[in-house]
């Protein structure tokens, strides 16, 4: 039902959902710190623009008694319960930040009259695509899918001379929230990825994965999985791997690969890691000092959510426009704003654009090296290392089907 918004007369409130069930197991205190740091920046920017207004955040906590799984499994009801709590207290702000779980975002979007914008650090699933008042500040599954299709089709690079049309996808159900939805998108029979591939099989058991590594009758040389190097090692160990196997390890929110002293373990030599660009590193910033590489992206998305709201508020106030209108709710897309770590671009559907980076392990240096980058905004691949020191024959990626000639 319609809830009055605390969003006028020079006072603008942000409702931040602090849910027990979250895409990443981040202490809520750290998210509060990120939000508060964002508020300080927004207040400064508004003041500099000569806008004498008040911006505050209200943190809405769920009781944690019923919904205490800690992951996203019971988030659907928790999100709706929190909305009910907001409704009963008549405490809705100009914008809702959170939730991060796909289930809860989807349900909240469905069950409410969304005349206010919703900003999410997460909501990775395809079911949250193309939502008119939803903005997602962490790369959603759709962006990953578009990269993979683009990369599979590429056949004109010195190191990739074959188009691929096949793949195995390893998905055992124990994935983190981001990985769950990324793999879910690849598995879905109606998705763009499935539509563009001629063959795709999901491997659900460890043994299935392990058997494929040396199976002469395998239908594809390419296996996509999601997680970190340790996750791969647990599964693969030191098993022998056929020389034309390529494992694509999706590990978007982990910038450890770019740290100076990191050496790639031997079991990573058949692996291409897909991660996000480190951008202008946040390692030394006050807000990120106590966060792990993955958590940094999550907390940063909360902080950037606040900065995005500040950006939109400034534009609407300068134009003398009302904040509590559908126009405001639908405006959080197709724009660039000053994020904490430089400009952040949102696409036509309010989803963050980024640069994905494909890394390989150099057989010479045992270091991770950038093979290519992919700009989600223009759906374009940029080769970086034209003569990679691969483990694969002739320093070229193999064909996806053993024994098949040039495509």
């Amino acid at each position: 039902s319609q809830v009055s918004q605390n969003c006028h007369n020079g006072s603008y409130e942000i409702s931040v959902l602090m849910m027990g069930n979250s895409a990443f197991a981040e202490p809520l205190k750290n998210l509060e710190d990120a939000v508060n740091e964002g508020l300080e920046i927004v207040r400064g920017r508004l003041q500099n623009a000569g806008l004498n207004v008040t911006v505050n955040a209200t943190f809405m906590y769920s009781d944690g008694l019923i919904h205490n799984s800690g992951d996203c499994r019971s988030s659907t009801c928790e999100g709706l319960d929190l909305l009910r709590k907001i409704s009963n207290a008549q405490r809705m702000g100009c914008v809702l930040i959170g939730p991060s779980c796909t289930y809860s975002t989807f349900q909240m979007y469905l069950d409410t009259e969304l005349s206010y914008p919703m900003i999410s650090a997460g909501s990775f699933g395809l079911s949250c695509d193309y939502k008119e008042t939803l903005t997602r500040l962490m790369s959603p599954a759709r962006k990953l899918m578009y990269f993979l299709v683009n990369f599979w089709k590429t056949n004109d690079l010195p190191f990739k001379t074959y188009s691929w049309s096949t793949s195995y996808v390893y998905k055992n159900g124990t994935e983190t929230e981001d990985c769950f939805w990324y793999l879910n998108a690849l598995e879905a029979s109606v998705s763009y990825f499935s539509h563009e591939l001629g063959f795709k099989v999901v491997l659900r058991q460890d043994k299935e994965f392990q058997d494929i590594l040396m199976d002469h009758n395998r239908k594809s040389n390419v296996i996509i999985m999601c997680g970190g190097p340790e996750f791969l090692y647990k599964l693969k160990g030191d098993r022998a791997v056929a020389e034309d196997i390529v494992i694509i390890l999706v590990d978007l929110f982990n910038d450890q690969y770019f740290e100076d002293n990191v050496t790639a373990p031997d079991y990573m030599k058949n692996v291409l890691v897909l991660t996000l660009s480190p951008g202008n590193s946040l390692l030394n910033s006050s807000f990120s000092r106590n966060l792990s590489p993955t958590k940094r992206d999550f907390a940063l998305a909360y902080l950037n959510g606040i900065l995005l709201f500040g950006h939109m508020l400034k534009i609407f106030l300068e134009n003398g426009e009302n904040i509590t209108t559908p126009k405001f709710a639908h405006a959080f897309r197709n724009l660039t704003f000053e994020g904490y770590d430089g400009p952040v671009t949102l696409d036509d559907w309010g989803d963050v654009d980024s640069t994905m980076v494909l890394l390989y392990t150099s057989v010479d240096t045992k270091k991770y090296k950038v093979l290519l980058t992919y700009d989600t905004h223009v759906n374009k691949t940029y080769p970086v290392d034209m003569s990679p020191t691969f483990t694969w024959k002739n320093s070229k990626l193999p064909n996806d089907i053993t024994g098949r000639g040039p495509q």
Partner: antibody, heavy 124, light 107 residues
Framework: EVQLVQSGAEVKKPGSSVKVSCKAS????????ISWVRQAPGQGLEWMGG????????NYAQKFQGRVTITADESTSTAYMELSSLRSEDTAVYYC?????????????????WGQGTMVTVSS | DIQMTQSPSSMSASVGDRVTITCRAS??????LNWYQQLPGNAPTLLIY???NLQSGVPSRFSGSGSGTDFTLTISSLQPDDFATYYC?????????FGQGTKVEIK
């Protein structure tokens, strides 16, 4: 506050080369691209090329391909632009400019810090 | 290469006037359009990036709009410091290209 300081004015003979330096201070050099832009007397701005750290190599406008070389020395936070086979129409002010590019892409958000410019005169 | 065309190439205006300069790209550049101001004898300075974002420290009388191929720079109330040459520039792909410039002179 980031500053770009360029080397001093040069007078060159046709057919010779010129090398202009651009030293950055007060910021992270490798987090940005450096572009070189020139402006002939009374004319508009012309992008010559730039160097983006992640790609390592420089990119050049077709017009200058083969004549211009852009390099960067991260240890001294200095970028260089060398133009060879000079002709009288190369007489111009040459600017270096910090370019806020998108990491791993060629898209950018503008050139937000400029050097003071280096006047290069080509005359026999 | 993407061609950038500015209009007018020069104009006369008075202090307090509202000034509009347009820039057209030969193909769609999304919102990757930047505006620069160049005072005589000085290096250019960035005013607006990504079509409509005001660069830090730039007065709010400057604003930008547009996407695709057509863009506008507006100065809501011209000040004495604003008599200069203005350039648009696309930064979606290499080579980055500039418009030919618009000179704003005192009427």
């Amino acid at each position: 506050e980031v500053q770009l300081v360029q080397s001093g004015a040069e007078v060159k003979k046709p057919g010779s080369s010129v090398k202009v330096s651009c030293k950055a201070s007060g910021g992270t050099f490798s987090s940005y691209a450096i572009s070189w832009v020139r402006q002939a007397p009374g004319q508009g701005l012309e992008w010559m090329g730039g160097i983006i750290p992640i790609f390592g190599t420089a990119n050049y406008a077709q017009k200058f391909q083969g004549r211009v070389t852009i390099t960067a020395d991260e240890s001294t936070s200095t970028a260089y632009m060398e133009l060879s086979s000079l002709r009288s129409e190369d007489t111009a002010v040459y600017y270096c400019a910090r370019t806020r590019y998108i990491w791993g892409s060629y898209r950018a958000y503008g050139m937000d810090v400029w050097g003071q410019g280096t006047m290069v005169t080509v005359s026999s | 290469d993407i061609q950038m065309t500015q209009s007018p190439s020069s104009m006369s205006a008075s202090v307090g006037d509202r000034v509009t300069i347009t820039c057209r790209a030969s193909q769609s550049i999304s919102s990757h359009l930047n505006w620069y101001q160049q005072l005589p004898g000085n290096a250019p300075t960035l005013l607006i990036y990504y079509a409509s974002n005001l660069q830090s420290g730039v007065p709010s009388r400057f604003s930008g709009s547009g996407s695709g191929t057509d863009f506008t720079l507006t100065i809501s109330s011209l000040q004495p410091d604003d008599f200069a040459t203005y350039y648009c520039q696309q930064s979606i792909s290499l080579p980055y290209t500039f418009g030919q410039g618009t000179k704003v002179e005192i009427k």
